[in-house]
Interface confidence: medium
């Protein structure tokens, strides 16, 4: 490898640019050294002296090679619906992400500005699209032959059990009740639970309001921060 010995400051020739980790100082008209992450420019360079760098103070940071006069302030502490996934250090900002059971309704450059609880599909409705770190759950009415009897952000509609003799027919929110002793399951697809957004933290549950009557529609419910759609519980 070629020897790369620093010799800043220096004047760039026409047609050439300053090297990596150097910047062009308009006042000195020289290529000067940048400060490393975790530092800032305490004294700017001159024609005869290079940039003087100093460490960032507590609760401030610089993530990139820079020549800023002051380090950036770390973001405010994470709210109760968030977890701190990256601490504030001299080289990186604090990053807050949503707790399990919540999704990011308003993101920022890194992490999340506003978390919201994942929609819970009420009985008669199942999860059509699971929640992710950045999107809410989408619920759908259980199709004929399927049901969901839970208020959940993860349960999908399950097939009714097939009875030799039916005592009570199933509906969208209740399984069929058989009189025979050996009911059989239909072959409709079916894992019961869908995965939550990835997290290593403990589950944070919300109190669940009483479910209301399920409508007899069969469309996918809208996403978004509008008032709770039918088939889902309020936030």
């Amino acid at each position: 490898l070629p020897a790369q010995v620093a010799f800043t400051p220096y004047a760039p020739e026409p047609g050439s640019t300053c090297r990596l980790r150097e910047y062009y100082d308009q006042t000195a008209q020289m290529c000067c050294s940048k400060c490393s992450p975790g530092q800032h420019a305490k004294v700017f360079c001159t024609k005869t002296s290079d940039t003087v760098c100093d460490s960032c103070e507590d609760s401030t940071y610089t993530q990139l090679w820079n020549w800023v006069p002051e380090c950036l302030s770390c973001g405010s502490r994470c709210s109760s619906d968030q977890v701190e996934t990256q601490a504030c250090t001299r080289e990186q900002n604090r990053i807050c992400t949503c707790r399990p059971g919540w999704y990011c309704a308003l993101s920022k450059q890194e992490g999340c500005r506003l978390c919201a609880p994942l929609r819970k599909c009420r009985p008669g409705f199942g999860v059509a699209r699971p929640g992710t770190e950045t999107s809410d759950v989408v619920c759908k009415p259980c199709a004929p032959g399927t049901f969901s009897n839970t208020t959940s952000s993860t349960d999908i509609c399950r097939p009714h059990q097939i009875c030799n003799v039916v005592a009570i027919p199933g509906n969208a929110s209740m399984d069929a009740v058989c009189t025979s002793t050996s009911p059989t399951r239909s072959m409709a697809p079916g894992a019961v639970h869908l995965p939550q957004p990835v997290s290593t933290r403990s589950q944070h549950t919300q109190p669940t309001p009483e479910p209301s009557t399920a409508p007899s529609t069969s469309f996918l419910l809208p996403m978004g921060p509008s008032p709770p759609a039918e088939g889902s519980t309020g936030d």
């Epitope: 010799f7 220096y10 020739e13 026409p14 047609g15 050439s16 020289m30």
Partner: antibody, heavy 119, light 111 residues
């Protein structure tokens, strides 16, 4: 690999004209400033002219100002030197060279083309 | 006369260390512009040896090193070898001339 190939040299009478070409390959031509350097027989190196990557900025040595014109065709990856009103003291091997993007210096050179100005 | 001043010749025995000086002025080295060094073997085009005072392009042996301080610069060659016999040129940008300038060249002879 980077290659620079000059052509267009030859014998010309004083007051005459000649156009040198330098075909470049093996690098992003538009990203580099280019230059012409000459060397009279048995003498040292003399910078002649330079041009920026886009072609907007040009530079000339006092000895050729007003007589020589540097240009480039980036679509053809070719550098040119139009030499008019040639004099006996312009006799030299003419090299085209690529200017280093960082710090400066001419990092690649062609093999040179001989221009002889004589009656 | 060249804007950058070099000795016309230097010599040394194989294995020895030699230095070639290059003296500039306030409008080139003194203005902060770097020094570049070229080696020209007989009958060939110049080759960049050192650029930006001290930087060796890949493929250049570490026997070659550059130095600059104020308005003067130097090229040092250690462990001199027969194949180092060549002409050596220093070069910089000159702000008063708005152009690039070369030293007159130094012929290195390996005894």
């Amino acid at each position: 690999q980077v290659q620079l190939l000059e052509s267009g040299g030859g014998l010309v009478q004083p007051g005459g004209s000649l156009r040198l070409s330098c075909a470049a390959s093996g690098f992003s031509f538009t990203s580099y400033a280019m230059t012409w350097v000459r060397q009279a027989p048995g003498k040292g190196l003399e910078w002649v002219s330079g041009i920026s990557g886009g072609g907007a900025a040009t530079f000339y040595a006092d000895s050729v100002k007003g007589r020589f014109t540097i240009s480039r065709d980036n679509s053809k990856n070719t550098l040119y030197l139009q030499m008019n009103s040639l004099r006996a003291e312009d006799t030299a091997v003419y090299y085209c060279a690529r200017q280093s993007q960082y710090v400066g210096g001419f990092d690649y050179w062609g093999q040179g083309t001989l221009v002889t100005v004589s009656s | 006369q060249s804007v950058l001043t070099q000795p016309p010749s230097v010599s040394g025995a194989p294995g020895q260390r030699v230095t070639i000086s290059c003296t500039g002025s306030s409008s080139n080295f003194g203005a902060g512009y770097g020094v570049h060094w070229y080696q020209q073997l007989p009958g060939t085009a110049p080759k960049l040896l050192i650029h930006g005072n001290t930087n060796r392009p890949s493929g250049v042996p570490d026997r070659f090193s550059g130095f600059k301080s104020g308005t003067s610069a130097s090229l040092a060659i250690t462990g001199l070898q027969a194949e180092d016999e060549a002409d050596y040129y220093c070069q910089s940008y000159d702000s008063s001339l708005s152009g690039w300038v070369f030293g007159g060249g130094t012929k290195l002879t390996v005894l």
